[in-house]
């Protein structure tokens, strides 16, 4: 039960996280005009990964796409790439994890296959979350650098006679959405990996062995794995150690050490 809950929760958390990463990537407010201690302009500038927007005091907003690829800063391109990689990995991870869910039965899929798929999706979610966090952090670092550069320009002047209205940019809503979404995807991935451990059969197939004092007569229990018997029953292959210690996920009764062949 705990494994199912962990896996299900991991899936839901990752799903929310990836939806957040997609939302952040599409949002226009990655950087917004800093209004603090700045000349108050009648226009409000904000920028995303794909376009920049200007909102007039009337509320009229005009957005322009970055219609160049080569003319864009390398850092922006890197952030775009990280976010897209994060989305793609997350989407694949979601697809894989749907089939890996313990509560969904697809044909006669082995539990070991489900465990592998759960681990795969978990790793994908972790990498996806890290990509999003990295992308947002790179952009934030770029903003901080530019902010202090423009602040220095504002107070030291540019050497020319003409003053310019320095538009400084600060963190936009998309950065916070991205950080939270990346974190959620990461947490979801970790939960999937934890769930995988509960799903996976142990590597050594120990047989149930009955030891007698004489040491001569040994009875072996063939078939160390118990097959699952259908939807809703125990879907994990349990090993029988000394009669098979039961986990909370088990529904069926397992043979004790006194059940001989």
């Amino acid at each position: 039960m705990a494994v199912t809950a962990c896996q299900g929760l991991g899936f839901v958390v990752s799903l929310i996280g990836i939806a957040g990463i997609i939302a952040a990537t599409c949002m226009d407010q990655w950087s917004t005009q800093d209004l603090y201690n700045n000349p108050v302009t009648a226009v409000f500038n904000y920028q995303g990964l794909w376009r920049s927007c200007v909102r007039e005091s009337s509320g009229f907003t005009e957005c322009r796409g970055y219609f160049t690829l080569l003319g864009l800063p390398a850092m922006l391109q890197a952030v775009r790439a990280l976010m897209i990689v994060g989305i793609v990995l997350g989407a694949i991870g979601l697809l894989v994890s749907i089939f890996a869910l313990k509560c969904i039965r697809i044909g006669s899929m082995e539990d070991s296959a489900k465990a592998n798929m759960t681990l795969t999706s978990g790793i994908m979610f972790i990498v996806s979350g890290l990509c999003a966090i990295a992308g947002v952090s790179v952009f934030a670092n770029m903003l901080v650098t530019n902010f202090w550069m423009s602040t220095a320009n504002m107070y030291t002047g540019m050497g020319g006679m003409v003053q310019t209205v320095q538009t400084r940019y600060t963190f936009g809503a998309a950065l916070f959405v991205g950080w939270v979404a990346g974190g959620l995807t990461l947490i979801g991935g970790v939960m999937m990996c934890i769930a995988c451990r509960g799903l996976a059969p142990e590597e050594t197939n120990y047989k149930a062995v009955s030891y007698h004092a004489s040491g001569h007569s040994v009875a072996y229990k063939p078939g160390g794995f118990k097959a699952s018997t259908g939807f809703g029953s125990n879907t994990k292959n349990k090993k029988i150690y000394d009669g098979g210690a039961r986990t909370e996920d088990e529904v069926q009764s397992y043979p004790s050490k006194h059940d001989y062949v």
């Epitope: 000349p39 108050v40 302009t41 009648a42 509320g59 209205v165």
Partner: antibody, heavy 119, light 113 residues
Framework: QVQLQQPGAELVNPGASVKVSCKAS????????MHWVKKRPGQGLEWIGG????????NYNHKFKGKATLTVDKASSTAYLQLSSLTSEDSAVYYC????????????WGQGTVVTVSA | DIVMTQSPSSLTVTAGEKVTMNCKSS????????????VTWYQQKPGQPPKLLIF???TRESGVPDRFTGSGSGTDFTLIISSVQAEDLAVYYC?????????FGSGTKLEIK
């Protein structure tokens, strides 16, 4: 067509206050900023401030802070400019102007109210 | 505050002539976000309120004759009337509508011979 109606003239005593009205018709009043501009004889135009009727958000020219107060009455689609502690320096034509939707320009203007401060 | 300096303060021309008036701002009025210059030109005829002619430095307001042309970027702006008509007798103001407080130039008075 947007129309801004202002009273023709106001005669007030020094030290007193005056409230100039500007009634808008022919447009969605709450959508656009309403600005006030002062024009003294032989001088240029001076922006007093602007107010957005939808949320009463406003911007004042610091020169007029304490002198001018901008308000709106959404029900009657009317903007008001209140001038306090009047002196002869406040004698001027006061225009209300509605901001454009697409830019920060003043697209529509009232005919102006002549405020005369005289004992 | 941004200071808008207009020149000349007045000029007298004959009908049909080309007129150029200038406006210089103390700070750049170019918004890099959309590459637009936030300068507006108004025409004020005697006894009338000002009328919007040009916004964003070069965009003509609907209904304004095409003999009026605005140009310039950053701090230097120009209003050109290609062929002056008698009805163009007015004072022309440029305005900063980028940084608060919005400021107007002192005006250029156009007189017709």
């Amino acid at each position: 067509q947007v129309q801004l109606q202002q009273p023709g003239a106001e005669l007030v005593n020094p030290g007193a206050s005056v409230k100039v009205s500007c009634k808008a018709s022919g447009s969605t009043f709450t959508t656009y900023w309403m600005h006030w501009v002062k024009k003294r004889p032989g001088q240029g135009l001076e922006w007093i401030g602007g107010i957005r009727p939808s949320d009463s958000n406003n911007n004042y020219n610091h020169k007029f802070k304490g002198k001018a107060t901008l308000t709106v009455d959404k029900a009657s689609s009317t903007a008001y400019l209140q001038l306090s502690s009047l002196t002869s320096e406040d004698s001027a034509v006061y225009y209300c102007a509605m901001g454009a939707y697409y830019s920060n320009s003043f697209a529509y203007w009232g005919q102006g109210t002549v405020v005369t401060v005289s004992a | 505050d941004i200071v808008m300096t207009q020149s000349p303060s007045s000029l007298t021309v004959t009908a049909g002539e080309k007129v150029t008036m200038n406006c210089k701002s103390s700070q750049s009025l170019l918004n890099r976000g959309n590459q637009k210059n936030y300068v507006t030109w108004y025409q004020q005829k005697p006894g009338q309120p000002p009328k919007l002619l040009i916004f964003w430095a070069s965009t003509r307001e609907s209904g304004v004759p095409d003999r009026f042309t605005g140009s310039g970027s950053g701090t230097d702006f120009t209003l050109i009337i290609s062929s002056v008509q008698a009805e163009d007798l007015a004072v022309y103001y440029c305005q900063n509508d980028y940084v608060y407080p919005f400021t107007f130039g002192s005006g250029t008075k156009l007189e017709i011979k």
